[in-house]
Interface confidence: low
């Protein structure tokens, strides 16, 4: 990657305009604060890619990091990302704004951190203070990053002087959290139960010999305590388990169950929580919409998918025109219902190489002893259009007729066009569309029939030509949602002794 100007640090004037260019052997992109600002991307004749970022009417808020990176999904190597830092000294901007989460620095161990107070001008002197103290702290400052060091649990502010005024930053709070080395995991036999069923939770701690378990759960708040059982998993050393078992759950037992584990030697502790839902009775609920009309294309495979939530696990049946469907031995139909989470299911009907006979009314029914749901839709088989016949005739009336017949589903549209210059048409001259216009001296009559058994439409269109004084190429084009088909016939005047 080549960046112009190369940086790595630039100081630009407020209100000015500045152009950054990045080029590379693959597509490149400029990034600012994890986003891609508007930029012009190009590819040169020699295969080099470039991106030009124009910064207009610069303010202090444009101060910060700019990255040029390859615009693809491959893992970035070190030379695939160039960093540029731009300062725009702006006396109207004191400290650059921080996101709320940057003001609160949570620590889990004694480690070096950075208080990210940054200014727009690299020449400014910046000092760090405890929030309630005037003494500047002896911590190194990097204008691009902030103050880095090991900090106590306190609140801090940065100060600088711009012109003749002293400016304070927002307060930064350093907060040391006690995170234990205890590794706790909580799981439930089921996180959804019906009232009257049992709730059973397990809290497991690894790597400690002496621990204390404390459970918090909805029933405890009302003073109805449940005695957990603690045991050692003998096949795994230092695996201790606490089991909380609530028989015959009530609706009030819904809520958060927390297992808090402490070990007194180092005063370490950890806790994990899990949500349990107690429902009055079982349920089946459809998720998302499935349109009442679905389409499949003839001879292609089509999967119809229904997503739903249910507890307890339901029975799922599919019907076509009120007849139960099952996996066909010929492999034409495949049914599957997958449990994608504890209570979420995906049921799929796959039609392999769809046939016309598979059009019809489909229903999926999911049910158990407490509830049921069903979803129905009509399946239409779309058939690409075919022109079956294009013929020309000379009735006694003196006019000439061309008849075009074709089929397809959904109903095809018919387009007639003609070309008088056979040598140049249709490559050089566009054909003329024909219709019911007297100018073109042609008349059109179209009939549409729906064939129930084949489940497709037939279109028959007759084009009447009043005066054909020289050979004419007439084209019939049929079009529908899944394709188009064209045939062409040459119509010659009555006087000419041949037909093509």
């Amino acid at each position: 990657l080549v960046v112009t100007p190369p940086g790595p640090e630039l100081v630009l004037n407020v209100s000015s305009t500045f152009v950054l260019t990045c080029s590379g052997s693959a597509p490149v992109v400029w990034e600012r604060m994890s986003q891609e600002p508007p930029q012009e991307m190009a590819k040169a004749q020699d295969g080099t890619f470039s991106s030009v970022l124009t910064l207009t009417n610069l303010t202090g808020l444009d101060t910060g990091e700019y990255f040029c990176t390859h615009n693809d999904s491959r893992g970035l190597e070190t030379d695939e990302r160039k960093r540029l830092y731009i300062f725009v000294p702006d006396p109207t901007v004191g400290f650059l704004p921080n996101d709320a989460e940057e003001l609160f620095i949570f620590l889990t161990e004694i480690t070096e951190i950075t208080i990210p107070c940054r200014v727009t001008d690299p020449q400014l002197v910046v000092t760090l203070h405890e929030k309630k103290g005037d003494v500047a702290l002896p911590v190194p400052y990097d204008h691009q990053r902030g103050f880095s060091g090991i900090f106590e649990d306190r609140s801090y502010i940065c100060k600088t002087t711009i012109g003749d005024r002293e400016v304070d930053s927002d307060a930064y709070y350093v907060y040391r959290l006690q995170v234990s080395s205890i590794n706790v995991s909580v799981n439930a036999v089921q996180t959804v139960v019906r009232q009257g069923e049992n709730i059973t939770l397990m809290c497991i701690v690894i790597g400690n010999e002496v621990v204390n378990f404390e459970w918090t759960y909805p029933r405890k708040e009302s003073g109805r305590l449940v005695e957990p059982v603690t045991d050692f998993l003998l096949d795994m050393p230092y695996h201790i388990r606490s089991i909380l078992h609530i028989p015959s759950a009530e609706l009030e037992d819904s809520g958060t169950y927390t297992c808090n584990v402490t070990e007194s030697v180092n005063d370490h502790q950890d806790e994990k929580a899990i949500n349990i839902t107690v429902v009055e009775s079982g349920y089946v609920r459809l998720l998302g919409e499935v349109g009442t009309l679905q389409f499949a294309e003839l001879h292609r495979s089509r999967t119809l998918q229904v997503v739903f939530e249910a507890y307890p696990p339901p029975t799922v049946l599919w019907f076509k025109d009120n007849r139960t469907l099952g996996d066909s031995s010929a492999g034409e139909i495949a049914l599957s219902t997958r449990n994608v989470s504890e209570t979420r299911y995906v049921s799929e009907l796959t039609l392999v190489r769809v046939k016309v006979a598979e059009a019809g009314h489909y229903t999926m029914r999911a049910f158990h002893e407490d509830a049921e749901v069903q979803l129905s839709f009509q399946l239409q088989i779309n058939v690409p259009v075919r022109v079956l016949e294009l013929s020309e005739s000379h009735p006694d009336s003196g006019e000439q007729t061309v008849r075009c017949r074709g089929r397809g589903m959904p109903q095809p549209n018919i387009i007639w066009s003609a070309c008088r210059d056979l040598k140049r048409c249709p490559r050089e001259l566009p054909p003329t569309l024909l219709g019911n216009s007297s100018e073109e001296e042609s008349q059109l009559e179209t009939n549409v029939t729906y064939w129930e058994e084949e489940q497709e439409f037939e279109v028959v269109s007759t084009l009447r030509l009043q005066h054909v004084d020289r050979p004419l190429s007439v084209r019939c084009t049929l079009r529908n949602a899944v394709g188009q088909d064209t045939q062409e016939v040459i119509v010659v005047p009555h006087s000419l002794p041949f037909k093509v």
Epitope: F104, F106, S155, Y173, Y175, L177, Q178, T216, T256, T258, N260, A273
Partner: nanobody, 124 residues
Framework: EVQLVESGGGLVQAGGSLRLSCAAS????????MGWFRQAPGKERDFVAA????????HYAESVKGRFSISRDSANNMVYLEMNSLKPEDTAVYYC?????????????????WGQGTQVTVSS
């Protein structure tokens, strides 16, 4: 023994404002998280907002963000909930709660001490 006493509830028109107060006593609250919860008739108790006593770091439920504001006055051991643009669905009993582990204030789980609650009714 920790005691929490709420006040400031009442009847207000939709779009109006109320300020709830919670007087905390019985100990110093450094290292505590203080929270407001609410319970509408026939519903579970829901988290509304929390604040850490020492540093004043705040956290809000999505449904009240931008309308409610939590604050504390450590000198007088008070916690406040400023409620603006009130809606009928804000009608509930509002409880003040205290958790001795401030680092947990985002988890909304374990508040060891609770007040008796104050009724807020928003009419349409």
């Amino acid at each position: 023994e920790v005691q929490l006493v709420e006040s400031g509830g009442g009847l207000v028109q939709a779009g109006g404002s109320l300020r709830l107060s919670c007087a905390a006593s019985g100990r110093t609250f450094n290292g505590y998280a203080m929270g407001w919860f609410r319970q509408a008739p026939g519903k579970e108790r829901d988290f509304v907002a929390a604040i850490t006593w020492s540093y004043g770091y705040t956290h809000y439920a999505e449904s009240v963000k931008g309308r409610f504001s939590i604050s504390r006055d450590s000198a007088n051991n008070m916690v406040y909930l400023e409620m603006n643009s009130l809606k009928p669905e804000d009608t509930a009993v509002y409880y003040c709660a205290a958790d001795p582990k401030a680092s947990r204030f985002r988890t909304l789980r374990r508040y060891d001490y609770w007040g008796q609650g104050t009724q807020v009714t928003v009419s349409s």
